[in-house]
Amino acid sequence: MNGSEYFVKIQSFLGGAPTEDLKALSQQNVSMDLATFMKLRTDAVLPLTVAEVQKLLGPHVEGLKAEERHRPVRDWILRQRQDDLDTLGLGLQGGIPNGYLVLDLSMQEALSGTPCLLGP
């Protein structure tokens, strides 16, 4: 069974998938569409890297531009380095500026909804 066939079989169960499962899926050429991606748990999407999301979505990665202001895409963008987002070539804006350090302070983030940044 190829990645696409596997994805079709598990698609309806993905809404509650944890980050680890999404990372694993990204290695299987599943080409997840944005309709499915947008239904994933935000907390499961946030830890994914740009490279992982690119692999997870495959050719559908262009759809991130269409949903850049909607959750979970918006929240995911805020967590990525702008340099990494730029590699997608989609014109996504709102990533962490170059030279900034991200402090993973869970309490700070829980309160503000965004990661804590330290300037250069």
């Epitope: 569409d33 944005l34 309709a35 991606f37 559908h60 202001r69 014109g91």
Partner: antibody
Framework: EVQLQQSGPELVKPGASVKIPCKTS????????MDWVKQSHGKSLEWIGD????????IYNQKFQNKATLTVDKSSSTAYMELRSLTSEDTAVYYC????????????WGQGTTLTVSS | QIVLTQSPAIMSASPGEQVTMTCSAS?????MNWYQQKPGSSPRLLIY???NLASGVPVHFSGSGSGTSYSLTISRMEAAFAATYYC?????????FGGGTKLEIK
């Protein structure tokens, strides 16, 4: 068959509010955002905003930020747009139109609701 | 916001004639969509992502362009194609539409 069914014409007084429904059928409601578009008489189209049925998250054209509120009722696959503090400038035809998540074109449109604001 | 300027505003064509209308963006956009609207009806998607024909649209229609300049071409005019045509960009919020080109039949 995909359908976006809007309500009939509305005549309301200045200062009042109105809530326009858009009842959908024939597709998976949560696979599409619902966008709303304004067309004043004899004029072009203006994008008001869109809402994601999965998160209830709405995004607005800044021009309509204080005019429109978009909501959805997933149980009935219906989207709503409420317009408040109505003036004659709000007299127009309002369309709901669907946009597949990840795409930026509107492939099916409602028939439009004509709103007339007059005392 | 990005302003889309359509030209001409009004044009007429004879049956069988080729028709081209343009849409100019105030700054670069990724893709362009085109819609057809007849009096008393809702807009109808014709072309999406610059050059893709929407479902059920006659092959007479085609779209092209990049950057700030886009066009819609009808290879052979028919009476049924008399309508107003709108371009729409999706690259920058808010989404915007052009002012329209009204196409009449001679």
């Amino acid at each position: 068959e995909v359908q976006l069914q809007q309500s009939g014409p509305e005549l309301v007084k200045p200062g009042a509010s109105v809530k326009i429904p858009c009842k959908t059928s024939g597709y998976t409601f949560t696979d599409y955002n619902m966008d709303w578009v304004k067309q004043s008489h004899g004029k072009s189209l203006e994008w008001i905003g869109d809402i994601n049925p999965n998160t209830d998250g709405a995004i607005y054209n800044q021009k309509f930020q204080n005019k429109a509120t978009l909501t959805v009722d997933k149980s009935s696959s219906t989207a709503y747009m409420e317009l408040r503090s109505l003036t004659s400038e709000d007299t127009a035809v309002y369309y709901c139109t669907r946009r597949k998540l990840g795409r930026k074109f509107f492939d099916y449109w409602g028939q439009g609701t004509t709103l007339t604001v007059s005392s | 916001q990005i302003v889309l300027t359509q030209s001409p505003a009004i044009m007429s064509a004879s049956p069988g004639e080729q028709v081209t209308m343009t849409c100019s963006a105030s700054s670069s956009v990724g893709y362009m969509n085109w819609y057809q609207q007849k009096p008393g009806s809702s807009p109808r998607l014709l072309i999406y992502d610059t050059s893709n024909l929407a479902s059920g649209v006659p092959v007479h229609f085609s779209g092209s362009g990049s950057g700030t300049s886009y066009s819609l071409t009808i290879s052979r005019m028919e009476a049924a194609f008399a309508a107003t045509y709108y371009c729409q960009q999706w690259y920058v919020y808010p989404y915007t539409f052009g002012g329209g080109t009204k196409l009449e039949i001679k």
